[in-house]
């Protein structure tokens, strides 16, 4: 079959991009005597990226798009895994098209995983966004969670603080968020096994579970928590840590009184 | 040149179990490709069917997902179908084709005929 | 699930340029292909990954895909042409491949 092992020179960045169904431009037409406004690169389309995890049969193609635009003309590259991607890095190599602001690699296979990062650049500014790509069975399959999520958070005293796990498995999976917690002064029970506390977990939609709210948080509450997935063929995890500041001394509310409810201990592998 | 080749009984009764099979020449059922069934019933479109990877992985249209089984032997370099419950609804040209994320070798193509 | 929609015919004079569509939703997100069918035979591929070409297929021959609309452009219509094409895409999101309804294109 065919399988092209160059990148495909299409034609140079445009920003009038014939990706989108948008016909504004935020430029300004060039006249004899006037320069364009310089702008730095922009994503035209953002709604089209928001899909960040690709989990992807064998043997499929990828297309990952970062459509943009900029005055002068943005110039466009992928790297893999925060590195230079280069075609002869993978069989098969990969198409560039830049005319929509697109990489496509053909047949993957299990070497491809990773993370895929487009940078749109010129002289007035960068951006860049990077993709997650899984290979995976379609057979069922271990969950597979977003890389970076949940993520960090560093929240004020009082405040509501929402992390989110994104989760692609087949099949049905169940989801707990878990928090670290202390028994009698110690954060390891007697099997050697951390005292976990259960704050939430999936019932017949999951979808609602890939979110955990905090309202009104409390230093108590900074710690580690623990995204928590799991189906019939094995399990998956990836945790964050809460950071509750106090105000300044001279900012500080009335003293807040929420006790920790604990819902109940699980030792946790 | 991978070449692929249908087989099976061209008239199935209604109720009963139609059943192909695709022998692949030329290639290894065990590269990187899926293995696929696409019909087309007389003066009509293209219907995908399904698929299957050597490895056994399966993908099947949710319209027939019920009715269909696909299955590969490793062995004799082949691949199956069976489509239980037929009425005269599944007369059509069924083809056998290798698949990336498109179709790039196709058999012949042979014409099933649901009657009694 | 996915939708694919294609015209059901579409005539042009030999010579002139054949432009067939393919809608569907968000499909510049998805690599489209393209299969020319004459009657009594299987399909052949004519372009793949939205506007690559498979060796031995015409110069003619080529695609374009944005937005929610995928093409396929044949120039210089010759009367060996005159077939159904059809669009493919694999849906990333349902994991199936869906076919459009075909397209009979005429040659005058």
């Known amino acids: 079959r065919p399988s092209p092992t160059l990148p495909e020179q299409d034609a140079l960045p445009s920003s009038e991009d014939d990706d989108d169904d948008d016909d504004s431009s935020s430029e300004e037409k060039e006249t004899d005597n006037t320069k364009p406004n310089p702008v730095a690169p922009y994503w035209t389309s953002p709604e089209k990226m928001e899909k960040k995890l690709h989990a992807v049969p064998a043997a499929k193609t990828v297309k990952f798009k970062c459509p943009s635009s900029g005055t002068p003309n943005p110039t466009l590259r992928w790297l893999k895994n925060g590195k230079e991607f280069k075609p002869d890095h993978r069989i098969g190599g990969y198409k560039v098209r830049y005319a929509t602001w697109s990489i496509i690699m053909d047949s993957v296979v299990p070497s491809d995983k990773g993370n895929y990062t487009c940078i749109v650049e010129n002289e007035y500014g960068s951006i860049n966004h990077t993709y997650q790509l899984d290979v995976v069975e379609r057979s069922p399959h271990r969950p597979i969670l977003q890389a970076g999520l949940p993520a960090n958070k560093t929240v004020a005293l009082g405040s509501n603080v929402e992390f989110m796990c994104k989760v692609y498995s087949d099949p049905q999976p169940h989801i707990q968020w878990l928090k670290h917690i202390e028994v009698n002064g110690s954060k390891i029970g007697p099997d050697n096994l951390p005292y976990v506390q259960i704050l939430k977990h999936s019932g017949i939609n999951s979808s609602d579970a890939e979110v955990l709210t905090l309202f009104n948080v409390t230093e108590a509450q900074s710690g580690e928590y623990v995204c928590k997935v799991s189906n019939y063929i094995g399990e998956a995890n990836q945790s964050a840590w809460l950071t509750v500041t106090r105000p300044a001394l001279e900012e500080r509310p009335a003293v807040m009184t929420s006790p920790l409810y604990l819902e109940h201990h699980h030792h946790h592998h | 040149q991978v070449q692929l080749q249908e087989s099976g009984p061209g008239l199935v009764k209604p109720s009963g179990t139609l059943s192909l099979t695709c022998a692949v020449s030329g290639g290894s059922i065990s590269s990187n490709n899926w293995w696929s069934w696409v019909r087309q019933p007389p003066g009509k479109g293209l219907e995908w069917i399904g698929e299957?990877?050597?490895?056994?992985?399966?993908s099947y249209n949710p319209s027939l997902k019920s009715r269909v089984t696909i299955s590969v032997d490793k062995s004799k370099n082949q691949f199956s179908l069976k489509l239980s419950s037929v009425t005269a609804a599944d007369t059509a040209v069924y083809y056998c084709a290798r698949a990336t994320d498109w179709f790039d070798a196709w058999g012949q193509g042979t014409l099933v005929t649901v009657s009694s | 699930s996915y939708v694919l929609t294609q015209p059901p015919s579409v005539s042009v004079a030999p010579g002139q340029t054949a432009r067939i569509t393919c809608g569907g939703n968000?499909?510049?997100?998805?690599?489209v292909h393209w299969y020319q069918q004459k009657p009594g035979q299987a399909p052949v591929l004519v372009v793949y990954d939205d506007s690559d070409r498979p060796s031995g297929i015409p110069e003619r021959f080529s695609g374009s895909n944005s937005g929610n609309t995928a093409t396929l452009t044949i120039s210089r219509v010759e009367a060996g042409d005159e077939a159904d094409y059809y669009c493919?895409?694999?849906?990333?999101?349902?994991?199936?491949?869906?076919f459009g309804g075909g397209t009979k294109l005429t040659v005058l």
């Open positions: 299957i990877y050597h490895s056994g992985s399966t």
């Open positions: 968000n499909i510049g997100s998805e690599s």
């Open positions: 493919q895409v694999w849906d990333s999101t349902s994991d199936h491949r869906v």
